[in-house]
């Protein structure tokens, strides 16, 4: 884990949030875990951050991620009137100035330091499931989701006819 107080780091004014002048609808500081209750953790190694999927020891503190929620037009909007075809997008930031990014070439999920406005690779379309889990679809590559592969986060292609409830792309958000 980062060894910093996530809550303290995030008391600054709504994470100075604005994307191209648009403020998020809301922000939510939460721990992120897999469908099978493994924790997503972040560690500084060789001057870069690594993302791990691991079982935490009893009483070990979970890392927190700041989710910022934005409203955006859905690309397949047919009506063109701006009313229909909205979607919720999120950015995920485990510490100041660092955001999860989709690296579509490498099919990987990486932490990058960047300034605003954030690139499209930092935005994920939020899906919430009947299991009350969520999944994160790449804005830059529809049908590709953040998932778990070999104890790491990776980008996973989900066939459109498949059930989005494939366990390896489901995550739980928790305030604790």
């Amino acid at each position: 884990a980062f060894g910093i107080s996530g809550v303290q780091k995030y008391t600054r004014a709504l994470h100075d949030s604005s994307i191209t002048g648009i403020s998020p609808i809301t922000e939510y500081l939460a721990s992120l875990s897999t469908y099978n209750d493994q924790s997503i953790t972040f560690a500084l190694e060789d001057e870069s951050y690594e993302i791990y999927v691991e079982d935490l020891k009893k009483d070990e503190k979970k890392d927190k991620v700041l989710l910022s929620y934005y409203e955006s037009q859905h690309p397949s909007n047919e009506s063109g009137d701006g009313v229909d075809g909205k979607m919720l997008m999120v950015t995920l930031s485990p510490t100041k100035d660092f955001w999860l990014h989709a690296n579509n070439k490498e099919h990987s999920v990486e932490l990058h330091k960047c300034e605003k406005p954030l690139p499209d690779q930092a935005f994920f379309v939020l899906h919430n499931m009947h299991s009350n889990c969520v999944s994160f679809e790449c804005k830059t590559d529809p049908g590709v989701f953040i998932g778990v592969k070999d104890n790491h986060l990776a980008l996973i292609k989900v066939d459109s006819s498949e059930n989005l409830c494939t366990e390896n792309i489901l995550f739980k958000l928790s305030e604790t």
Partner: antibody, heavy 122, light 107 residues
Framework: EVLLQQSGPELVKPGASVKISCNAS????????MNWVKQSHGKSLESIGD????????FYNQNFKDKATLTIDKSSSTVYMELRSLTSEDTAMYYC???????????????WGQGTLVTVAA | DIQMNQSPSSLSASLGDTITITCHAS??????LSWYQQKAGNNPKLLIY???KLHTGVPSRFTGSGSGTLFTLTISSLQPEDIATYYC?????????FGSGTNLELK
Amino acid sequence: EVLLQQSGPELVKPGASVKISCNASGYTFSDYNMNWVKQSHGKSLESIGDINPKNGDTFYNQNFKDKATLTIDKSSSTVYMELRSLTSEDTAMYYCARHYYYGSSYGGFVYWGQGTLVTVAA
Amino acid sequence: DIQMNQSPSSLSASLGDTITITCHASQNINVWLSWYQQKAGNNPKLLIYAASKLHTGVPSRFTGSGSGTLFTLTISSLQPEDIATYYCQQGQSYPLTFGSGTNLELK
């Protein structure tokens, strides 16, 4: 223009079944789950469940697991709800409704059908 | 299931009044609360989503606020066309649940 057009009113006998429909137009049908909501006369709204047009995956509110079955006909962009073993308690207006956000229930229901009144009487 | 406790169940007000309806969620739903207006014999209409975002075409006299577990819908300068029943609904968690409704009538 997004339209959810529901089938007409039904008068059915206790113990029988009824199948009502909701035809969607004006948007990409497969992009949004279709939800069903019950409203008994003078009462509040109650979510029955929903169906995913991409794959037919269904979710039912626990209270309706043994009462409702949702199905889909992708070719006509129509969703069906069958209600079985009907009793007077099932007499209500039934609405189909579509979420505001693609992929998410967080924004509530932005489009509603006009409702189908189901009356259960001997 | 998340319970949505809405109050008052009925409300009498005069034209031009400001009225407030409250919705209390049994657990934290962040801002994922919607408000609907339903006139007699009609289907519900979305007024406000994400607790405070006004849906397209809804008059600005309707305002929503709150987050977490406590939410309010305020109608300022009540108009004759506002006479209806109002419902809150949480979208955070399945099954999706509604408040019991507030019937607004003219004094």
